[in-house]
């Protein structure tokens, strides 16, 4: 099976979906935004719903210019985010406190500029273990009730445990179909030994699986994006299946409770 | 076509200021950062530091306080200024735009700065 | 400090031959490594970044790989016009940096 993440850094976003064979894994970032064409491949919530607005005050827009979202964050600091390692990018803004997919002002957004991108050592592109990074933001946010950090939990997840997906990536695979506004999706959190049967010699304890038998999935554009869990942020959009939300084929995120040490060291050698 | 193309002095004074300039052409600077490179006649390439559109800037630790790097506020050129120069500052400077993935897939043709009284 | 140390400074080869450069980062730069191309006299030409990503219109003889501290560019069928020096810089960070390049490697006609 060949691996393929959840971004998409192909951001002229005419990548023609018949380009990633079917039965092949992706990187879930995307080329979404307002010139998104209906045939790229990437970027996706599956199956989710509108998130209420104020419920997600984390969650956070990469973007590249003009106003092209290319990747999920989390606010876990007043001056730092947590994202996918393989959204990586030199020059990009951030949106934080913004509903909808589209660059139209909202009273509650605040923009920024990541002034510092930390990716984990251990990350290998064009793997997928330790696949995160810190982003310092050019100032510290004001907080808001849309816009506020999460605590990442200390705590390994359990199999069966309920999550919270959130993101702007396409809401169909193979096709693409960009929501409106933030889409949100119910997950459960899968033991390791199916994930490592999803995905065989794949899965190492830096990730973990999550997902459900009726079609729901995050997929590319989501990447980066927030799993919360018991209140907590547990996870972030990684990697998985294309297309996007097969049976079986769960999505695969960065096992942030790993990482607790490396972030809250990582932020204090930077702040 | 995209371009990048270095100007300036070819002697400068020692305890001089070396100013020189990157004309840009073909792409927004307003989407790319930049960066400032050097190369001592006979050496291998230095790096001086890079611009961002949202005017970050990172110097390397040799060049912060003799270096400032800046971009024209119509963002179609940037900007070098090496002050306190010496001889060891002869080099060939080139500007170059990074691809936005950590490579610099677009470089100037290079300006030769001789240091010299 | 990061600091990119390359291997050999120089080496000799012949047309056809395959050759190996390497690049060893003082501490883990993941992936965050590129390679340049320069001959005499010219601006340094990007090659691989990502440390295996092919940069647009670069034969497929040139390869990049590894992670972490070590890195390999891989020149498989050497020809008459790669003989250059060659260098590797690191995008991991740019905190306190002396140099993000290599010391560079010229390759020389045997």
């Known amino acids: 099976v060949t691996e393929h993440v959840l971004a998409n850094n192909d951001v002229s976003c005419d990548h023609p979906s018949n380009t990633v064979p079917s039965g092949s894994n992706q990187d879930l970032g995307a080329g979404a935004g307002e010139d998104a064409r209906s045939d790229d491949s990437s970027s996706r919530i599956i199956n989710g719903s509108d998130c209420d607005m104020h419920t997600q005050p984390w969650q956070a827009a990469l973007l590249l210019r003009p106003n092209q979202l290319y990747c999920g964050a989390v606010l876990v600091h007043p001056q730092w985010l947590l994202t996918a390692a393989h959204c990586r990018k030199k020059v990009f803004r951030v949106r934080l406190g913004h509903y909808s997919l589209s660059p139209v002002y909202e009273s509650g957004q605040q923009m920024f500029q990541g002034v510092k991108s930390i990716p984990h050592p251990g990350y290998s592109h064009p793997g997928h273990s330790n696949d995160l990074m810190l982003i310092k933001l050019n100032r510290r946010i004001r907080p808001t009730k849309d816009v506020r950090p999460i605590n990442v939990s200390s705590h390994c997840p359990s199999a069966g445990t309920k999550c919270l997906v959130s993101g702007w990536g396409t809401t169909k695979s193979p096709q693409v179909h960009f929501p409106k506004v933030l889409q949100c999706l119910n997950i459960s959190v899968l033991s390791q030994k199916r994930c490592e049967d999803a995905y065989p010699r794949q899965i190492d304890d830096t990730m973990f699986c999550a997902g459900d038998k009726a079609g729901r999935d995050s997929c590319q554009g989501d990447s980066g994006g927030p799993v919360v869990c018991n209140g907590s942020l547990q996870g972030l959009v990684s990697w998985g299946d294309y297309p996007c939300a097969r049976p079986n084929r769960p999505g695969v995120y960065t096992n942030l409770c790993k990482f607790t040490k490396w972030i809250q060291e990582t932020i204090q050698a930077n702040s | 076509e995209v371009q990048l193309q270095e100007s300036g002095p070819g002697l400068v004074k020692p305890s001089g200021t070396l100013s020189l300039t990157c004309a840009v052409s073909?792409?927004?600077?307003?989407?790319?950062?930049m960066s400032w490179v050097r190369q001592p006649p006979g050496k291998g390439l230095e790096w001086i530091g890079d611009i961002y559109p949202s005017d970050i800037i990172d110097y390397a630790s040799w060049a912060k306080g003799r270096v400032t790097i800046s971009q024209d506020s119509s963002k179609t050129q940037v900007s070098l200024k090496l002050s306190s120069v010496t001889a060891a500052d002869t080099a060939v400077y080139y500007c170059?735009?990074?691809?936005?993935?950590?490579?610099?897939?677009?470089w100037g043709q290079g300006t030769l700065v001789t240091v010299s009284s | 400090a990061y600091q990119m140390t390359q291997s050999p400074s120089s080496l000799s080869a012949s047309v056809g031959d395959r050759v190996t450069i390497t690049c060893q980062a003082s501490q883990s730069i993941s992936s965050w490594l590129a390679w340049y191309q320069q001959k005499p006299g010219k601006a340094p030409k990007l090659l691989i970044y990502?440390?295996?990503t092919l940069a647009s219109g670069v034969p497929s003889r040139f390869s990049g790989s590894g992670s972490g501290t070590d890195f390999t560019l891989t020149i498989s069928s050497l020809q008459p016009e790669d003989f250059a020096t060659y260098y590797c810089q690191q995008g991991y960070t740019n905190s306190n940096i002396i140099n993000t390049f290599g010391g560079g490697t010229k390759v020389e006609i045997k």
């Open positions: 170059a735009r990074d691809n936005n993935d950590y490579g610099l897939d677009i």
């Open positions: 990502l440390a295996s």
């Open positions: 073909g792409f927004p600077l307003s989407n790319y950062a």
